[in-house]
């Protein structure tokens, strides 16, 4: 049984290699997939000596690693690109990494919109 | 290191019961999701139950819907497999095993082995 | 209800290549079904070998790799070993929290 899922629609767009794939630097992205199947959103990014580099997010295809988890969070220890996928509209706006060594909390915040 | 560490098999009856353990360590539990996968004797391995990180969401092999129950104790790192109404076709070595990303299994128990029969 | 197929047996020469398949009854594999594949020798836990398609788990020699052929998932063993005769099985997501095992391939290596 699947319950108290979050539905997700939408998701944070964002990708670095923008103009070499030929995509959106950055957006929302509407989330499509087959009837059944549970959708997510992700980030991914690099961590160069505190600088954090951000690589990817979007939708992610039902995975179930994924399954009820509300807030992206990253836990492998120091990997070349830091992953996290999470349920729910916009769950990937930040993202957080979360070493399993108990190494110390670091949460991204998006940079704030610049006012119109 | 990673370890998983299965207990609670045994020879049951026929309509019997049983409570599998699979105990967790060298990595933090609460983060991903576990499976259960059998494996009768000579045969092949066959995909039991799946739980969320959470608990949340719990699913099932269609032959053992409605008889086994999957749950975890996040606090004590320990996964669970109910097994009521046991049948001779539940014999099987029964694996623990995490799930990562993209859904795969990437460690495994060593098993135990659950024998149904009178 | 969803049927994963694979090769029953198969045979390779020392120092061969072999290609081993994963297939279903309800259409082609695509990487969405985030096929697996898995070691197995008796008497012992599974092994993993491959996710995601291509990804090798680590540890595993670049002998092993993975990919899609036409409509299948494959497994591909280059100069095959005497210790790589075992059991296979490949495994695909099929979604909403379900996983189907094939049937396994017993890979025999000559001589």
């Known amino acids: 049984s699947g319950r108290g899922e979050a539905e997700t629609r939408e998701c944070i767009y964002y990708n670095a290699n923008w103009e070499l794939e030929r995509t959106n630097q950055s957006g929302l992205e509407r989330c499509e997939g087959e009837q059944d199947k549970r959708l997510h959103c992700y980030a991914s990014w690099r961590n160069s000596s505190g600088t954090i580099e951000l690589v990817k997010k979007g939708c992610w295809l039902d995975d179930f690693n994924c399954y009820d988890r509300q807030e992206c969070v990253a836990t492998e220890e120091n990997p070349q690109v830091y992953f996290c996928c999470c349920e729910g509209n916009f769950c990937n706006e930040r993202f957080t990494h979360l070493p399993e060594a108990g190494g110390p909390e670091v949460t991204y915040e998006p940079p704030p919109t610049a006012p119109t | 290191e990673v370890q998983l560490l299965e207990s609670g098999g045994g020879l049951v009856q026929p309509g019997g019961s049983l409570r599998l353990s699979c105990a967790a360590s060298g990595f933090t539990f609460r983060n991903d999701a576990m499976s259960w996968v059998r494996q009768a004797p000579g045969k092949g391995l066959e995909w039991v139950s799946g739980?969320?990180?959470?608990?949340?969401?719990?699913f099932y092999t269609d032959s053992v819907k409605g008889r086994f129950t999957v749950s975890r104790d996040n606090s004590r790192n320990t996964l669970y497999l109910q097994m009521n109404s046991l049948r001779a076709e539940d014999t099987a070595v029964y694996y623990c095993a995490k799930v990562y990303y993209t859904s795969f299994f990437d460690y495994w128990g060593q098993g135990t082995l659950v024998t149904v029969s009178s | 209800q969803t049927v994963v197929t694979q090769e029953p047996s198969f045979s390779v020469s020392p120092g061969g290549t072999v290609t081993l398949t994963c297939g279903f009854n309800s259409g082609s594999v695509s990487t969405s079904y985030y096929p697996s594949w898995y070691q197995q020798t008796p008497g012992q836990a599974p092994r993993t070998l491959i996710y995601n398609t291509n990804t090798r788990s680590s540890g595993v020699p670049d002998r092993f790799s993975g990919s899609i052929l036409g409509n299948k998932a494959a497994l591909t063993i280059t100069g095959a070993q005497a210790d790589d005769e075992s059991d296979y099985y490949c495994v695909l997501y099929m979604g909403s929290g379900i996983w189907v095992f094939g049937g396994g391939t017993k890979l025999t290596v000559l001589g």
């Open positions: 739980i969320s990180v959470t608990g949340g969401s719990t």
